[in-house]
Interface confidence: low
């Protein structure tokens, strides 16, 4: 006959207050004859949790029918768990003896601990927008979990990030813990549509991590590029000039045209074209009146984007009496 083994498969059992906990115990042999009892703790002060033969255990039920002769499953369920129930539980085999049964073998024990799920991670980005190639910080917080062990990962568009620092508080024993992590993310020009994700994995979540997200569109400012061009066709004394404002984000944009230093047209960007990467394009048109008496006309397109310092691009129109429908190059 093989030697009796007492199998308690779970080293740790996490339970929630008010729920029912199942403590597993199976034996590999029916011999020696004698009962299996459950205790919390070890030594002389251990507490009897369940004895099928005697005592009153209103919160404990058995998983299997212990009266069957060939039963090898001595698992129990404890209902209405409270914080007072935490501890290590042992199933112990006794050998029939006279006058009292004698302890024969104990299982390795299952530690019952109170588990609490972490709250949904909240991700907060920077207070102000930053341009591409710069680094911004995102913080992620989750609270109220137990036990203390927890895993936090950061992702940007599905790619795992490595530049982050994480703290779990408090450092000592506590009923519940909090985690706070700060990730440093380098902004790319196409990040208008990007997301950062904070992923929290905890034993209470049973392999289904919680995620918090933040859109990089809230953190990024993509400054525009300007191009001023003269249209090749002239209509009478008028030349059409365009200022193409490309690849900017967010939408907020004011444009000013000036002719030889004199402001002559102001516009706020509307009816923008959205690019595939989430940035915007906009074109402003300006009609210049040209008379034969005017030799040089310098046009300036000035753009103020999202409250930042203005940027501008100039175009010198070389106008002569003989000029016919020709365009000029832009000057920086």
């Amino acid at each position: 006959e093989e030697e009796l083994q007492m199998i308690q498969p779970e080293k740790l059992l996490l339970v929630t207050v008010g729920k029912t906990a199942t403590l597993h115990c199976t034996v590999t042999s029916l011999l020696p004859v004698g009962p299996v009892l459950w205790f919390r703790g070890v030594g002389p002060g251990r507490e009897l949790i369940y004895n099928q033969k005697e005592g009153h255990f209103p919160r404990v039920t058995t998983v299997s029918d212990l009266t069957k002769r060939n039963n090898m499953d001595f698992s129990i369920r404890i209902s209405s768990i409270t914080p007072a129930d935490v501890g290590t539980y042992y199933c112990v085999k006794f050998r029939k003896g006279s006058p009292d049964d004698v302890e024969f073998k104990s299982g390795p024990g299952t530690e019952m601990a109170l588990g609490a799920k972490p709250s949904a991670p909240v991700v907060l980005g920077p207070a102000a927008r930053t341009t591409p190639e710069h680094t911004v910080s995102f913080t992620c917080e989750s609270h109220g979990f137990s036990p203390r062990d927890i895993t936090l990962k950061w992702f940007k568009n599905g790619n795992e990030l490595s530049d982050f620092q994480t703290n779990v508080d408090p450092t000592g024993q506590s009923v519940a813990y909090s985690i706070r992590s700060t990730a440093r993310v380098v902004l790319d020009p196409w990040d208008v549509r990007s997301q950062v994700i904070c992923e929290v994995a905890h034993v209470t979540l049973q392999g289904d991590p919680l995620r918090g997200t933040a859109n990089l569109s809230e953190a990024i400012r993509v400054p525009p590029t300007l191009e001023v061009t003269q249209q090749p066709m002239r209509v009478g004394n008028q030349v059409n000039v365009t200022c193409q404002v490309r690849k900017f984000y967010p939408q907020s944009l004011q444009l000013t045209w000036s002719e030889n230093g004199n402001v002559c047209q102001r516009e706020t960007a509307s009816t923008l074209t959205e690019n595939k990467d989430g940035t915007y394009n906009w074109t402003s048109w300006f009609l210049v009146n040209i008379s034969d008496q005017r030799d040089d006309v310098v046009l300036t397109c000035q753009v103020k984007h999202d409250g930042q310092l203005a940027v501008s691009k100039r175009l010198a129109l070389e106008v002569t009496v003989h000029q016919k429908d020709q365009s000029s190059d832009a000057t920086p």
Partner: antibody
Framework: EVQLVESGGGLVQPGGSLRLSCAAS????????MHWVRQPTGKGLEWVST???????YFPGSVKGRFTISRENAKNSLYLQMNSLRAGDTAVYYC????????????WGQGTMVTVSS | DIQMTQSPSSLSASVGDRVTITCRAS??????LAWFQQKPGKAPKSLIY???SLQSGVPSKFSGSGSGTDFTLTISSLQPEDFATYYC?????????FGQGTKLEIK
Amino acid sequence: EVQLVESGGGLVQPGGSLRLSCAASGFTFSSFDMHWVRQPTGKGLEWVSTIGIAGDTYFPGSVKGRFTISRENAKNSLYLQMNSLRAGDTAVYYCARGGNWDDALDIWGQGTMVTVSS
Amino acid sequence: DIQMTQSPSSLSASVGDRVTITCRASQDINNYLAWFQQKPGKAPKSLIYTASSLQSGVPSKFSGSGSGTDFTLTISSLQPEDFATYYCQQYNTYPYTFGQGTKLEIK
């Protein structure tokens, strides 16, 4: 390490079917568009199919109605079901990942050979 | 469908040379153009995306430029490992299409 590994290629008769698989690892598979591209021996590259993160699918006219693309995010797997195969479908089939939002094909598998011949 | 035309189809050059490969799209592709390098028996490798952005880990001797319909790939100083076939690809519009390839050989 970000990696794509194709499997399921082999010899099949004209009119037959084959299912290719692509196992992804090292990145969050569900966050990326995925593509199949093929290359007949000694020839250039040809885009075969795309599946978006929302399950939307795209095909060129040459395979539309014969090929289907699918993904199983829980298994980090991409599939290409090829029916009514023709000799012209003979090629090395690569799976590739679409880049972050931009959709450029940034990571490629090593390829699996499909031969359609009687 | 958008046609992608690469030139030249093949190119002989020496180590240390600067080479340029061009790619023309049959219509505007909004800079959604990628360049790939492929060596015999190997999978393509991404070099450039959105016409001029260098893929992570790719040496800076590779550069891309162009906009609208005309694009170029430049390799500033050829090394032995750069002899391969290069493909351009547009991903602005389905169906995605590739150029026919440019085979770069040692002179």
